[in-house]
Amino acid sequence: AQGKEVVLLDFAAAGGELGWLTHPYGKGWDLMQNIMNDMPIYMYSVCNVMSGDQDNWLRTNWVYRGEAERIFIELKFTVRDCNSFPGGASSCKETFNLYYAESDLDYGTNFQKRLFTKIDTIAPDEITVSSDFEARHVKLNVEERSVGPLTRKGFYLAFQDIGACVALLSVRVYYKKCPELLQGLAHFPETIAGSDAPSLATVAGTCVDHAVVPPGGEEPRMHCAVDGEWLVPIGQCLCQAGYEKVEDACQACSPGFFKFEASESPCLECPEHTLPSPEGATSCECEEGFFRAPQDPASMPCTRPPSAPHYLTAVGMGAKVELRWTPPQDSGGREDIVYSVTCEQCWPESGECGPCEASVRYSEPPHGLTRTSVTVSDLEPHMNYTFTVEARNGVSGLVTSRSFRTASVSINQTEPPKVRLEGRSTTSLSVSWSIPPPQQSRVWKYEVTYRKKGDSNSYNVRRTEGFSVTLDDLAPDTTYLVQVQALTQEGQGAGSKVHEFQTLSPEGSGNLAV
């Protein structure tokens, strides 16, 4: 921003009424008037170029310094060419001297040269030659000097002529301020420019109404340079929640809009499934039945829990059940759907029911499922099972109702035994099996059925209470089809797979090998 100039003295604007002191009186500098465009133009002039030893002084009135630290002095003047005068006028000069003196009081007409300190010799860039002077084409020069730091209540300027032909048309004394500024939503007060060229005055800014320094951000600061220019902005303010930047101010969000945090972003329209917000809203309330999860951004539409899983099937396979379902028809507007499976078992005889999580095994943890199927095993035979699949999303915890579907299944058979060949010879096969421990108490006996492969007319059956059997009197080098089935009080359980086991050939007789 451009520096602001505060004028302390303006000769040209004073219309000749300042009454500056001249020394010696009347013989050196004197006030003159000219009319230009029907307006009087005043100037102090001196032109005693033909007389040697000139020492003519013009002193301003006392100027109150006020808050100025460094003053700037702008001079507008003409200087006539010494060659305009006969023989170049040996005593003629083309410069004059600028002085200043500080004081705490106005000395009035008591003029003492010794109190003055020279600022500079003022030389023109362009001198006015005879032909220009006579044609009224005078060359106006503009020179600027500065002085500081000033410390007393006021000061005088003085102009010393030592034999030049000078007309002083304008003397303007001013100091500079960095103007009041709004930047980055911070207000910086009008600040007096410092007096030392290298230094920059650090000025703290104040956030405008409804603006704040963002968390972890730097407080707004700027630097006021000697020339009244603001430099090096640091930090900024942001419009607080519920307000947005409009030009250099923070304006409340319009009804139906919101802003949830201090940021540079504008207010956003209230998302779907929210109520119309009032002016200056930081968020938009959800419609009835819709919710916002704690981690949901305020810009996200309000959502609701999902409906129940759409379609649930339970397919029993012996002592296993495969549960399959399809996603809810209404996701509630969310994508974070998970499923929970719970199990209840009922004894048909007593009708008594209870949870069965401890006794069954799931193919994957039954809570927080993202897939739409799970296998439940280790089910007890002749038991009724009810499976519940609940669909949940990020806002399900905000309501008391649940969205679930149930499926029931009756387990009528034990799980098929798992059969393995323990050993063999030319005439025997040793076979063992296993079933899940929870089902073992229900098994009365195991029935082993075997026959030669390719012979569908005859088969042999052996029953045992144990978990193994040796089948004897078999033909060597012959493949047998073997199946094991559990027998329960209620009837036959599920049969195992039919296994093919081969006896050894005679060459390997005497060896019992697996």
Partner: antibody, heavy 120, light 109 residues
Amino acid sequence: QVQLVQSGGGLVQPGGSLRLSCAASGFTFSSYAMHWVRQAPGKGLEWVTVISHDGTNTYYADSVKGRFTISRDNSKNTLYLQMNSLRAEDTAVYYCARASVGATGPFDIWGQGTLVTVSS
Amino acid sequence: SSELTQPPSVSVAPGQTVTITCQGDSLRSYYASWYQQKPGTAPKLLIYGENNRPSGVPDRFSGSSSGTSASLTITGAQAEDEADYYCNSRDSSGTHLTVFGGGTKLTVL
């Protein structure tokens, strides 16, 4: 209206004294330097003396230096010329005049003139 | 020298243009002022500075300067312009504060 009204002239013997007055009206007297200019009978104008607006500075023509004293009373809006040791060559019509700007004029307002005759 | 020199007399026919000159070293440094004086009256300011006329002065009066010379020109002289005319300038020599020319008697024939 703006005017200067003079008084105090007359006949005086050589070596005598006389005081001329010039009463100002219609302008801010204390803001202007004031001059006396004289004109001997049948002759041209001759500048005599000046006093600054506040009375702190005066300047005289060599011909009257040491004999004449210019003064002013800004509270009475009046300019004075005290003439001592008068000589026959001081015989003239004396005019008071206002310097419109600065110390040296131009002289934009003149009194009506008052005749001083130095004769035995 | 600190003198300003004017011709003692100049005449002009009514309606004609007449120029009165003023010579002096001071005029190199400072502009002349011109005064008109009619018999038995105080002088009256006609021209000052570059070529400035106080209000009430007819525009047939004008001033100019060049080098050590200043001129007062009356364009279309009238009978009432018959008077004595004096030039005046600051003194650049330091001898005097201000100097008058000897005056020029203008006769309108």
